[in-house]
């Protein structure tokens, strides 16, 4: 805390400009009017204040706005935003996408900080849902943003927002998240034709059920192995050898290299060996010829 001292004669700040970087901390405290600072916040970003000086400027704003800063000030915080704590940010009411963009720009190129996470949380809660423009903005700054949300949070994403999602935005999503996103993507892209649809839906397929994979296998999509390896194991297991062959097209040869990894390994164990042999890939581990397969889950459902 800076002691309260009178401003020296002739040093009272009439505007926020570079002359203030020559002020000692106590002079800034004594000579800069908080209301002046609030109205000229946009100038701060161009001026190289030291961290210590920024602490004083923040303190002045905190005194002026103990209940939280108004959006007119927040939008122009510039690099003073880096001085804010999550507790400070929780007092804010940020409704403008322009304000959000301005503050994300300050943090650009860095990992998502607790401050940014709090800001985004406040913004999204204020809007009630993750609309397309917000999602566009957030994934542009933080490609992994979508995958940082819980399945519950993702449920508030409207299908229309899915158009803003790029494949790299889903790189770190786990199956539970894709389970939520896939139906939304399916809905969003439903009016597209076969090949275009597959291009768009491909990165969401880690949440696809068996029946959708069966449908895709009828459309000559030529799914690559990387996509296949990300499919839900429980969705892959019921697929027949013929269906997998159709689904992968020329990429079916890649199964050999992945035969020890899930979901390929588990799928092989469920197929008849003579069916696997028709692929000519030397896949081993299928059910030997002459053995009867009982689907116990089906039997339990019937009893």
């Amino acid at each position: 805390e800076v002691e309260k001292t009178a401003c020296p004669s002739g040093k009272k700040a009439r505007e926020i400009d570079e002359s203030l970087i020559f002020y000692k901390k106590w002079e800034l405290e004594a000579c800069v009017d908080a209301a002046l600072l609030a109205t000229q916040m946009d100038r701060v970003n161009a001026i190289p204040f030291t961290y210590e000086q920024l602490d004083v400027l923040k303190h002045k704003l905190d005194e002026l706005y103990p209940q939280g800063y108004p959006e007119s000030v927040i939008q122009h915080l510039g690099y003073l935003f880096l001085k804010m704590s999550p507790e400070d940010i929780r007092k804010w009411n940020v409704t403008s996408l322009e304000t959000l963009k301005a503050l994300l720009e300050v943090n650009k190129g860095h990992e998502m900080s607790p401050q940014v996470a709090t800001l985004i949380d406040r913004f999204v809660k204020g809007r009630g849902q993750l609309d397309k423009d917000t999602l566009d903005t957030l994934t542009a700054f933080y490609p992994g943003y979508l995958c940082s949300l819980s399945p519950e949070e993702l449920s508030s994403v409207p299908p229309s927002s899915i158009w803003a999602v790029r494949p790299q935005d889903l790189d770190t999503c786990d199956p539970r998240q894709l389970d939520v996103l896939y139906p939304k993507a399916r809905l969003a892209f439903q009016n597209m034709n076969g090949s275009e649809y597959f291009v768009k839906i491909q990165s969401f397929l880690g949440g696809a059920p068996t029946e959708d994979l069966k449908a895709l296998s009828q459309q000559n999509v030529s799914m690559d192995l990387a996509t296949f390896m990300k499919l839900r194991t429980d969705a892959v297991l019921p697929l027949t050898v013929a269906e997998v062959q159709k689904l992968l097209g020329p990429h079916v040869e890649g199964l050999k290299a992945e035969e020890r990894h899930r979901p390929v390994r588990d799928w092989i164990l469920r197929q008849r060996q003579d069916d696997l042999d028709t692929l000519g890939l030397g896949l081993q581990g299928g059910i030997p010829n002459g053995y009867l397969v009982l689907d116990l889950s089906m039997q339990e459902a019937l009893s």
Partner: nanobody
Framework: QVQLVESGGGLVEAGDSLRLSCVVS????????MAWFRQAPGKEREAVAS????????IYADFVKGRFTISRDYEKNTIYLSMNNLKPEDTAVYYC?????WGQGTQVTVSS
């Protein structure tokens, strides 16, 4: 992002001169105030001189007036700090800054 790289520091004797350079890359500077700061061991960082890139306005700290000169070269995106009649108390790490961006600093040591 803006990158600032200082150079020109060194060990000199009292009364000697040095010229520090700061090359800026990564973004246009029109909207920035650029400045030289210094930090002596155990002391707070303090502003030495500033130059407003768009208006050309120059400001100096009282303790360097008449001895130090800040200047700029548009074409080279560089600012300079010419330091004459150096004193032992000028010993510090000198930093260049543009808006929120700071360089890593260059050491100036003035022996008596």
């Amino acid at each position: 992002q803006v990158q600032l790289v200082e150079s020109g520091g060194g060990l000199v004797e009292a009364g000697d001169s040095l010229r520090l350079s700061c090359v800026v890359s990564g973004r246009t500077l029109e909207s920035y105030v650029m400045a030289w700061f210094r930090q002596a061991p155990g002391k707070e960082r303090e502003a030495v001189a500033s130059i407003n890139w768009s208006s050309g306005r120059l400001i100096y700290a009282d303790f360097v007036k008449g001895r130090f000169t800040i200047s700029r070269d548009y074409e080279k995106n560089t600012i300079y700090l010419s330091m004459n009649n150096l004193k032992p108390e000028d010993t510090a790490v000198y930093y260049c800054a543009a808006g929120r961006y700071w360089g890593q600093g260059t050491q100036v040591t003035v022996s008596s």
